[in-house]
């Protein structure tokens, strides 16, 4: 629809006034300073500095690998018996004296031989190592047990199996020098002993080896 001619004129005049003032706008007073901006990103790395002075000479170190390879020689011993056939139920069975070269080493010990336990009722027997008469305490005793329960009532007889077995372990905290390593047979706590036999009809051996820690 058409706009009346009077209204058109008024609109043109308004626009001219606005345009005129836009072109002549004076600058006002400075505003309050704005807040600081966020920190900028890191700059590029600087050039390396000049090398520092040499440090003081360090103390002579110990090469572990070198000292181990040069000074650790294998140290082991085997004592063997062709037929111990030892029927004791309590006491020392066999002994082997070993020369331990260092204090800060462990002893690995092994007894291998036939073991037998028999009884009509429940019984238990313990085979264990001693070192100069004392059991290992570094960390715990080296032992093996055989427990035999009573057989069925109708079988009024005892089973008699001799089986080659081993008692083995590591013991720490034993000083350098002569060490008497012995295998003993004894009782288990709270159980009656039976009829034990060690080393029947076969070779028995104690093997002792010194190991670095």
């Amino acid at each position: 629809s058409e706009i009346p001619k009077g209204k058109q004129k008024a609109q043109l005049r308004q626009r001219e006034v606005v345009d005129l003032y836009n072109g002549m706008c004076l600058q006002g007073p400075a505003g309050v300073p704005g807040r600081d901006g966020s920190p900028g990103a890191n700059g590029i790395p600087g050039t390396p500095g000049i090398p520092g002075r040499d440090g003081f000479k360090g103390e002579k170190g110990e090469c572990l690998r070198e000292s181990f390879e040069e000074s650790w020689t294998p140290n082991y011993k085997q004592c063997s018996w062709s037929s111990l056939n030892y029927g004791i139920d309590l006491g020392k069975i066999a002994e082997c004296t070993f020369t331990k070269m260092r204090s800060n080493s462990a002893l690995r010990v092994l007894f291998s031989g036939s073991l037998r336990l028999k009884c009509r009722n429940a019984c238990c027997q313990r085979w264990y190592f001693t070192f100069n008469g004392a059991e290992c305490s570094g960390p715990l005793p080296i032992e093996a047990i055989i427990y035999l329960d009573q057989g069925s009532p109708e079988m009024n007889s005892t089973i008699n199996i001799h089986r080659t077995s081993s008692v083995e372990g590591l013991c720490e905290g034993i000083g350098a020098g002569l060490v008497d390593v012995a295998i003993w047979v004894g009782t288990c706590s709270d159980y009656p002993k039976g009829d034990a036999s060690t080393g029947w009809n076969s070779v028995s051996r104690i093997i002792i080896e010194e190991l670095p820690k």
């Epitope: 204090s103 800060n104 034993i174 000083g175 020098g177």
Partner: antibody
């Protein structure tokens, strides 16, 4: 109380023999290595020989090897040192010394017995 | 074989004072070192083992320290009964039956 009592020392001619004894009490003798240590007049301590508790192992100082023999009788709690082909330089006070059961330091010593080798 | 060297050979100290004796091993022996005291005409007596542990009946004025190759025996408030010869011995490595040559502690 641990006690070690040596005996058997005396005057002997060069080339002669002597047997020293050491009677032990107050500890489990068979569990301990035993030693002989000697001291020449005005000198320091010189280890002579050691024997394990069981008697299964023995060692000697080079200066006495082949001439001296260490032994023990665990049933009698007694240590022995048989000394043969004695020399003037063997003149010393001989001590019997008990090694600690686990580490080889000497925790008890006898009072010593004097051996003099002279012509 | 490890060689044990003691110093000084002779040490003169007044009663009531402190004495410090040294023992050096030719190689490391951990803490496996013993000290012995020997008075004239008597057998040696164990004073210290494990470098720093006093043997039974040894007074607290005796103390040991050190580890590796350097060891020290210190006697505080010296009494007349303390003057004697002192020996060290390592028992870390076989053969361990070598003693130091001894230090004579005498009254100043």
């Amino acid at each position: 109380e641990v006690q070690l009592v040596e005996s058997g020392g005396g005057l002997v001619q060069p080339g002669g023999s002597l047997r020293l004894s050491c009677a032990a009490s107050g500890f489990t003798f068979s569990n301990c290595a035993m030693n002989w240590v000697r001291q020449a007049p005005g000198k320091g301590l010189e280890w002579v020989s050691v024997i394990s508790g069981s008697g299964g192992g023995t060692y000697y100082a080079d200066s006495v090897k082949g001439r001296f023999t260490i032994s023990r009788d665990n049933s009698k709690n007694t240590l022995y040192l048989q000394m043969n082909s004695l020399r003037a330089e063997d003149t010393a006070v001989y001590y019997c010394a008990k090694a600690n059961w686990n580490y080889a330091y000497f925790d008890f010593w006898g009072q010593g017995t004097l051996v003099t080798v002279s012509s | 074989e490890i060689v044990m060297t003691q110093s000084p050979a002779t040490l003169s100290v007044s009663p009531g004072e402190r004495a410090t004796l040294s023992c050096r091993a030719s190689q490391r022996v951990s803490s496996n070192l013993a000290w012995y005291q020997q008075k004239p005409g008597q057998a040696p007596r164990l004073l210290i083992y494990g470098a720093s542990t006093r043997a039974t009946g040894i007074p607290a004025r005796f103390s040991g320290s050190g580890s590796g190759t350097e060891f020290t025996l210190t006697i505080n408030s010296l009494q007349s009964a303390d003057f004697a010869v002192f020996f060290c011995q390592q028992y870390d490595i076989w053969p361990m039956y070598t003693f130091g040559q001894g230090t004579k502690l005498e009254i100043k």
